[in-house]
Each structure stands twice: as structure tokens, then as C-alpha cells.
């Protein structure tokens, strides 16, 4: 893959247009170091400025001042003000205002179920798979097999609970090492930011809403991935982190408490309850080598049964089976011992959609993803559409400035702590750092949030989620109580670590940028965003999977060059924007590399060939097939034979920069497509009125 | 009521081979294992070796293994003894004993075969 | 294999008395041990199982105690019928082992 979406020369003056992962765009000198590349051949750049290739430009009035991307969106209010109504048509504003909260809590109601039910899909596709990662003896010496372990299986059940409690459990038993289970639990919380990745995918529609939403959402991965990055060997060279939270748990004499609070499931449960339920036990018991659960089916049918304890006498192979000398016996021909034995007798059957189908898991599972993602994306474009048209105006303007506003001058760096604060509360709340984030997501998205901001309110989502992890320790039975609890301290110590990392300093806020020129380039190749989410959550865990049960020499040979490549590439695009003087000639730019290494552009012909079978195909029937459809043709005209569609290429004609001769309009690079800014396709028409 | 009947007395010369029957009654026959424990004169018991007559598993102890052999009839709900290789050490009472279900003790003994050898 | 040793090899006692057998195993045989009664010319009678388990019949006087390695058989007041040579056998590991015998006489 390329060392940079767009690697070409090092150019010394910043203010001219170029082709940048957003496109072209005037940038200021901070930000050059960033999007200053293009696919230019090698020329002496520092002897005369030259204008960019398409000179056509200058035909473009332009701007004084060109639009940052990153600028939250001004919504304009186009209806008719509070003071000028009559009466009736005040009762009717107020009583539309209600109706749209009711519409607007109701699908943010569903956009919950739907992720939860998105969770038991993903368990019920890859949840035994996932249980299989676990009963891999190789975690126990190998953390880099831990954290990859860690971040496939919560991908897999879409839940960091899940992969966590399974963690606690195998400790408990003595399968599992704290020091193991450490790299496993670093895994689990770069999986779990998969949720709201997922999410932003769903507003590929427009370009610059996607670009915000997917930063939005990436923060939360390039945060973790970081933190990993830097925390994994510090933590194998080190063992803090173990060595802290041992202390934590040894001087204080903890008592069992109540359960962690479970307040939104109490609104979520009796819904998502009648389309499935699922026995997570099942995942736990294949990841401690039960043999038995591996035929088992994760869909829950009885929910009412009785269970009676008896001991029976049991065959053994030999004595050397035996749980204990004292409960094996011979009959001079066999090995006895004795079992407890629950017998377990089925009174009442779940009610739920799938309980009578008796479906093998992966069909109920597929059903449900299917099901629960186009839930979620209606609900999504619903909730965009209605906040949309709720904060317009005045409104929009008092929630930006409160949301994004800081505080007076001596205590403005407090703002963020704040935030943190406000959204480790929020997820304590929702009980799921994934909901929060999730919904987070839409709001970064349509601008009343900024990525600024958003980023602390990842970061607290992330402390918020391990907070109810130790109350949830706290609360579990005595055997198990010290090593949930020390688990749930290793993750509360680990987001604490990452945060002091990456946020005290604003130097140091990396995943901001990171997260930025991944929306900058998700917005001008939206298939790179799916790309990106297979390659890092899907790829990479699954290829040093593979290494490392190859053992650990063929890992070392194969990570060390890789890791050695990386560094090298990092260092000298540092050095070109930097100081390329320093550099020979040759390298002072990306150039000598053949274009598929350097730029997305010829990947993208080869993806818009691959996908072009389908644009002629695709027949949607409403704005979600569309934007679904539109992320994988990349084209604003791929639903055809779409009302909705047809709407949006209509829509588009007067969203074009102003020109001086219309019959330029031929030539692509005047369109403020090519600038990188907002595409032709992107216009908000409204297909259906609220 | 449970009974195991032996059949009766042998006298053998060294290196012969002796087969002593075990005939049981009053209950299932391939429900117990039936153990055969000797004892020589004057002396304490000896566990030799188990059948289980419903599959014909049988164990044997370490020290016979080789030259004991047990087998079962379940038509005739018999159980059989034969030691081979016989020595003048082998004299002894033959007792075949009923095991308790899933246990190692006997609950109903036979009344004994004397096996006599002597050259 | 389970060595298993009985003391006293010999007991006088006269009826009436409390008598005390002990047995003691090489190894940890948990409760898997078993108590019999064997008079002159006759089979073996099983008194006790699972080490303090009384069998069908036996009377009450006849009771067994112990785990792991030590055991007891304990005939709270010996009665004529009683003078006999008691056993202890293990069932814990294969093969089977017997005591050497304790043989309780009359005084």
C-alpha cells in the first residue's frame, strides 16, 4: 500500500492549491505538513512556483477565503420565525417540536436495540469462532497473540463485556494468567471501537457529513490503536500495570457489592428480548475447552427451567483422571469418581422470534446483521434528518456554542476534563461505551459536535466503560472477585495511561490529526473507509494471528522488516516535510515510487472498475439502499432507477462554485469535487417530509 | 436370595492348569462384577482379578496377570477361573465374590474351592 | 500397589468389651475401604463399606470411621458371635488389597 494516500513532492510554499488527501485546497502552514502531496513529476520546486496543472482554475472566482472541511456547517434556518407566527401557527410549531422529539427518541430508542441486537448477531456469526481464539495455549508467552486475540474477538461478539467477562472467567480458572489477560483486555478495547466505525459508514451519503463522522469515529480507534502501541511494551517490559492494580486489590478488603446499575437496558431489554436472546455462557464455556458447548446453540430456548444438583458415580480413563484422590475409586474393573450433576429440566420456552425456527446459529446470525444494520442505518438518516431540521438557526447556534464553547480564559484547558467527565457519566448511563460513541457519531456528523471535542468525550467514554466494569466486579462471586476486579483495574489503568498519553498535551492529541487525514481521505475515496476497517480490525489481527501460531520466529521475521519499513517511511516523510533539504534529490519526494505505491488514484480506478458492475445494477428503493450503494460505486449516480437518487442529482446542479464561463462546466477541475470539497452528490435534499 | 455355588474340590500336580466354575443366582447376572479372591492356608486374602459377566471386561492383579484367566457364561449365568502354570503356592481356597454396584467391595461370597497342588 | 496393615494382628477381649480394630493405608485411598468377617471354614461376610457404611444386616454394633489413610472398625460390645478374623480391604486404586487379618479371641 502506499506510505501516504497522496505522496508527492515536498512543495515549500503552502498556499497554493494542491491535491491533497482532501483534494485541493488552500491550507494553513500547520496543516501542509499534512496534505502537502501530489503526483506532480519530479521538477525543482524551489526555483519557481508553478500553478497547478489544471490551469483552468483561474476561471474560478476565487474565494478569499476557502472553507476548512473540518469548519462545523452553518444550518440555516429557512422557516418562518417564532415572532411572526399566529397563533395557530405557534400551537402547530409547538405540537411539530413534540412530534419530532417523539420521533427523535424513538428512533434513537431503535438505534439502541438495533446496536444490541447488532451485538447478538455478531455473536451468534462468530461467537463460537471467538471462543475457539481463546482456548489457544500460545497466549499465555505470546502478548502480541493476546492482543490480537482480544481485538478479533470483541470485532466478532461486538462486545468488550462479552470478551471481558470470558477474560475474568479463564483467570478465575486458572486458565488464564493476569499478565495474559492484560494484552487480551488492550485487544478488547480497540475492538469495541469497531461500533461506532460501522455507524459512521452509514452516513457515506454526503461527503463532508461522512468525513466529519468517520474522524469522529476514527479518534476512538487511532486512540486505542496508539495508546496499544505505545502501552503493550511497556506494559510486557514493565508489568505496571499488573503490578499496580496486584497492590490496588491486596490492600483493600473488598466486599461483594450490588451489580452495576443496568439503566438503559431496562428500556432496551424488553424490546430486544422478543427478537432474540442468546446464551453467552456457551462462548465462555468454548473458550475453557468444553467440549460440549461446541455443539450447543447460542440461541437461548428455555428461559424457565429447574434445575436439581445430584452427584452420580462416573467412569474414568484412570485414577490419574480423578479431581481428587479422595473421590476416585476402583471396582476392581473400572475407575469411578463422582459428579455433581445438574440436571436440568426445561419448564417454560423463551419468547422470542427465533425460538421455534431452530435455525443453526449462523443463518439466526446472518438474519439479524442484515436486519439490525439497515434498522440502524434507517434509524441513523432518521435521527440526522430530524436533528437536522430541528437544529437550525438560533437553536443550532446555543447547542454548538454550548457543546463546543470552552470555558473563560484561565480555565479554558479545564473544558475538556469536563468532557471526559461528562462522557464517562453518559456512558455509565447507557452501561456501553459502543452506544455512546455510536451516537456520538451522527451528531459529529451533521456539525454540532465538533471532533475537537468529541475526541474527550471518547476518551471519558472509554474511563466510563471500565468504571462499570469494576462495579460489575465488585458484584461477582467470591472466587472470582479479585481477578474481575484486578482485570477491571488493569482496563480503568490502561485508558488512564492513554489519556495522559494523548490528551493533556495539545502536541500530543495525535489521533485527532491521524483520525482527520483518515476523513479527509474516506471523504474523496469513501470505499478506503471499508478498506480501512477490514485492513485494521479484520487483516492485521488475523495475519500476526496466523504468525504467531507459526511461532514466534516467523513472527519476528516477518514483523521486524514490516515494523522496520513503517519507521523507515514515517521518518522520511517526516524529513520531506520537515527539512527535505537534508534528503538527496531523489528522495526529497515520493516520485521514484511506481504511482500505485504513492496515490489512491490507480487503486481507485481499480475498485470503480470492480464496483461498476453493480452501479447499473443497483435498484434502490429508498435513501438507505442508496447510501449504501453509494458507498461501495463511490458515485452519486448509482441508484438509477431511485426516486430518492434521482432527487439528489437534480439537487446537485446548483451547488457548483461560481464560474466565469459556463461552459467550463466540462472541465472536472473546476468543480469543487476536484477541490475536495463538498462533491456534487452531496446536496441534503429531503426525500421525505417529516 | 443371592447365591454362588463353586464347584468343588481339585487336586493338581505343578504346571497343570485348574478351572474353577462360579454359578450365580437369585439376581442379574451381568448386572456385578464377580471378583475371585484365594486364600492360602492360614493365610489372609488375596484379590486376584474381576469380570464384569454383562460385557466380559475383565481386570486382573499384577501378579497373576498371564497365567489367570476369567470368563463368563451368560446362558448358564456361570463365571470361570482358570489358572494355569500351577505351583505348590497356588494351594489355596478359591472364593468368586459378587461386587457391590459400582464399588469394590463384595457383598456375597461363594463357599470356596479348595485347589490342592502337590506333585 | 496399596500396601494395606492391620493392628493388632491378635485381640483377646471378652464379650461386653469395646473393641477397636485400626487399619492403615501406604497411601490416600479417600473412604474406599471395606471391613469383613471371616470365621473358621466359612466365606467372608462384608460388615462395613465405604468406610463407615454399614451393610445390609450387620448389626448396629459394628460401626467403621476414618478417611485418607487411617481407618477403624469399632464393635461396641463384643458378643460371642463376634470372635471371628476381621479384614479391611481398600478399593481405592487397582488391584484390590487386603489387611493381613486381625483375629479377635476370647479372653
Known amino acids: 500500500m502506499a506510505p501516504w494516500p497522496e505522496l508527492g513532492d515536498a512543495q515549500p510554499n503552502p498556499d497554493k492549491y494542491l491535491e491533497g488527501a482532501a483534494g485541493q485546497q488552500p491550507t494553513a502552514p500547520d496543516k501542509s505538513k499534512e496534505t502537502n502531496k501530489t503526483d506532480n513529476t519530479e521538477a525543482p520546486v524551489t526555483k519557481i512556483e508553478l500553478l497547478p496543472s489544471y490551469s483552468t482554475a483561474t476561471l474560478i472566482d476565487e474565494p478569499t477565503e476557502v472553507d476548512d472541511p473540518w469548519n462545523l456547517p452553518t444550518l440555516q434556518d429557512s422557516g418562518i420565525k417564532w415572532s411572526e407566527r399566529d397563533t395557530k401557527g405557534k400551537i402547530l410549531c409547538f405540537f411539530q417540536g413534540i412530534g419530532r422529539l417523539i420521533l427523535l427518541l424513538g428512533f434513537l430508542y431503535f438505534f439502541v436495540c438495533s446496536l444490541d441486537i447488532l451485538s447478538s448477531a455478531f455473536q451468534l456469526v462468530g461467537g463460537k469462532m471467538a471462543g475457539q481464539f481463546f482456548s489457544n495455549s500460545s497466549i499465555m508467552s505470546n502478548p502480541l497473540l493476546g492482543l490480537v486475540i482480544g481485538v478479533l474477538v470483541t470485532v466478532l461478539v461486538q462486545s468488550s463485556s462479552t470478551s471481558t467477562s470470558i477474560v475474568v472467567s479463564m483467570v478465575s480458572s486458572s486458565l488464564l494468567t493476569v499478565r495474559a489477560a492484560i494484552p487480551i483486555i488492550m485487544g478488547a478495547n480497540i475492538g469495541t471501537s469497531i461500533t461506532n466505525t460501522i455507524v459512521a459508514l452509514m452516513q457515506v451519503g454526503d461527503r463532508s457529513e461522512f468525513r466529519r463522522a468517520f474522524a469522529g469515529a476514527t479518534v476512538h480507534d487511532f486512540f486505542n490503536w496508539l495508546s496499544v502501541l505505545v502501552l503493550l511494551p511497556v506494559e510486557v517490559a514493565t508489568h505496571y500495570l499488573e503490578i499496580i492494580t496486584q497492590l490496588i486489590v491486596e490492600s483493600f478488603h473488598f466486599k461483594n457489592g450490588e451489580d452495576a446499575p443496568d439503566l438503559l437496558k431496562v428500556i432496551t431489554k424488553p424490546f430486544t428480548k422478543l427478537i432474540v436472546q442468546l446464551d453467552k455462557k456457551v462462548i465462555s464455556q468454548i473458550a475453557m475447552n468444553d467440549e460440549k458447548a461446541k455443539n450447543k446453540s447460542l440461541v437461548k430456548i428455555w428461559c424457565k427451567t429447574f434445575t436439581n444438583k445430584t452427584q452420580i458415580n462416573v467412569t474414568v480413563p484412570s485414577t490419574a483422571n480423578c479431581t481428587s484422590p479422595s473421590l476416585c475409586w476402583t471396582d476392581g474393573i473400572q475407575n469411578w469418581t463422582m459428579k455433581n450433576v445438574t440436571y436440568k429440566e426445561n419448564i417454560a420456552k423463551c419468547q422470542h422470534i427465533f425460538v421455534n425456527f431452530h435455525l443453526p446459529d449462523l443463518a439466526v446470525g446472518t438474519i439479524l446483521l442484515i436486519l439490525s444494520l439497515l434498522v440502524l442505518c434507517g434509524c441513523l438518516i432518521m435521527i440526522v434528518k430530524i436533528l437536522g431540521s430541528v437544529l437550525k438557526g438560533q437553536v443550532a447556534t446555543v447547542i454548538k456554542k454550548t457543546i463546543n464553547t470552552d470555558f473563560p480564559f484561565p480555565f479554558a484547558w479545564l473544558t475538556g476534563y469536563l468532557a471526559i467527565l461528562v462522557g464517562a457519566g453518559m456512558t455509565f448511563i447507557v452501561q456501553s461505551s459502543s452506544v455512546f460513541t455510536s451516537a456520538l457519531t451522527p451528531l459529529i456528523g451533521i456539525g454540532v459536535i465538533t471532533i475537537e471535542r468529541a475526541y474527550p468525550l471518547t476518551l471519558g467514554s472509554n474511563i466510563g466503560t471500565t468504571t462499570t466494569a469494576i462495579l460489575a466486579a465488585l458484584a461477582s462471586p467470591g472466587n472470582a472477585l479479585r481477578s474481575s476486579l484486578q482485570i477491571a483495574l488493569c482496563h480503568f489503568f490502561f485508558n488512564i495511561s492513554g489519556i495522559l498519553l494523548w490528551y493533556p498535551i495539545p502536541f500530543t492529541r495525535l489521533p485527532i490529526r491521524m483520525a482527520k487525514g483518515l476523513g479527509n481521505i474516506s471523504a474523496k475515496y469513501r470505499w478506503f473507509a471499508v478498506f480501512y476497517l477490514i485492513i485494521f480490525f479484520f487483516l492485521i489481527p488475523l495475519t500476526v494471528f496466523g504468525l504467531s501460531l507459526a511461532g514466534w520466529r516467523v513472527l519476528v521475521g516477518v514483523g521486524v522488516p514490516v515494523v522496520f519499513i513503517i519507521i523507515l517511511v514515517l521518518c522520511l516523510r517526516l524529513l520531506q516535510s520537515r527539512c527535505p533539504r537534508v534528503l538527496p534529490k531523489k528522495l526529497q519526494n515520493w516520485n521514484f515510487l511506481p504511482l500505485w505505491m504513492r496515490s489512491l488514484k490507480p487503486w481507485d480506478a481499480v475498485v470503480s472498475k470492480f464496483t461498476g458492475c453493480f452501479q447499473m445494477r443497483c435498484c434502490c428503493c429508498c435513501r438507505v439502499c442508496c447510501r449504501a450503494c453509494c458507498l461501495l460505486c463511490d458515485c452519486p449516480k448509482c441508484c438509477r432507477c431511485s426516486k430518492c437518487c434521482e432527487d439528489l442529482e437534480e439537487a446537485q446542479e446548483g451547488q457548483d462554485v461560481p464560474v466565469k464561463a459556463p461552459e467550463t462546466f466540462d472541465n472536472i477541475t473546476i468543480s469543487r469535487e476536484a477541490q475536495g470539497e463538498v462533491p456534487a452528490s452531496d446536496s441534503k435534499t429531503e426525500c421525505t417530509a417529516l | 436370595q443371592v447365591q454362588l455355588v463353586e464347584s468343588g474340590a481339585e487336586v493338581k500336580q505343578p504346571g497343570e492348569s485348574v478351572k474353577v466354575s462360579c454359578k450365580a443366582s437369585?439376581?442379574?447376572?451381568?448386572?456385578?462384577?464377580l471378583h475371585w479372591v484365594r486364600q492360602a492356608p492360614g493365610q489372609g486374602l488375596e484379590w486376584m482379578g474381576a469380570?464384569?459377566?454383562?460385557?466380559?471386561?475383565?481386570s486382573y492383579s499384577q501378579k497373576f496377570q498371564g497365567r489367570v484367566t476369567l470368563t463368563v457364561d451368560k446362558s448358564a449365568s456361570t463365571a470361570y477361573m482358570e489358572l494355569s502354570s500351577l505351583r505348590s503356592e497356588d494351594t489355596a481356597v478359591y472364593f468368586c465374590?459378587?461386587?457391590?454396584?459400582?464399588?469394590?467391595?463384595?457383598?456375597?461370597w461363594g463357599q470356596g474351592t479348595l485347589v490342592t497342588v502337590s506333585s | 500397589d496399596i500396601q494395606m496393615t492391620q493392628s493388632p494382628s491378635f485381640l483377646s477381649a471378652s464379650v461386653g468389651d469395646r473393641v477397636t480394630i485400626t487399619c492403615s493405608a501406604s497411601?490416600?485411598?479417600?473412604?474406599?475401604v471395606t471391613w469383613y468377617q471371616q470365621k473358621p471354614g466359612q466365606s467372608p461376610k462384608l460388615l462395613i463399606y465405604s468406610a463407615s457404611s454399614r451393610y445390609t444386616g450387620v448389626p448396629s454394633r459394628f460401626s467403621g470411621s476414618g478417611s485418607g489413610t487411617d481407618f477403624t472398625l469399632t464393635i461396641s460390645s463384643l458378643q460371642p458371635e463376634d470372635f471371628a478374623t476381621y479384614y479391611c480391604?481398600?478399593?481405592?486404586?487397582?488391584?484390590?488389597?487386603f489387611g493381613q487379618g486381625t483375629k479377635v479371641e476370647i479372653k
Open positions: 497411601q490416600n485411598v479417600g473412604i474406599f
Open positions: 465374590a459378587r461386587g457391590l454396584p459400582y464399588l469394590g467391595a463384595m457383598d456375597y
Open positions: 480391604q481398600q478399593y481405592s486404586r487397582s488391584p484390590l488389597s
Open positions: 437369585g439376581y442379574t447376572f451381568t448386572s456385578n462384577n
Open positions: 469380570v464384569y459377566p454383562g460385557s466380559g471386561d475383565t
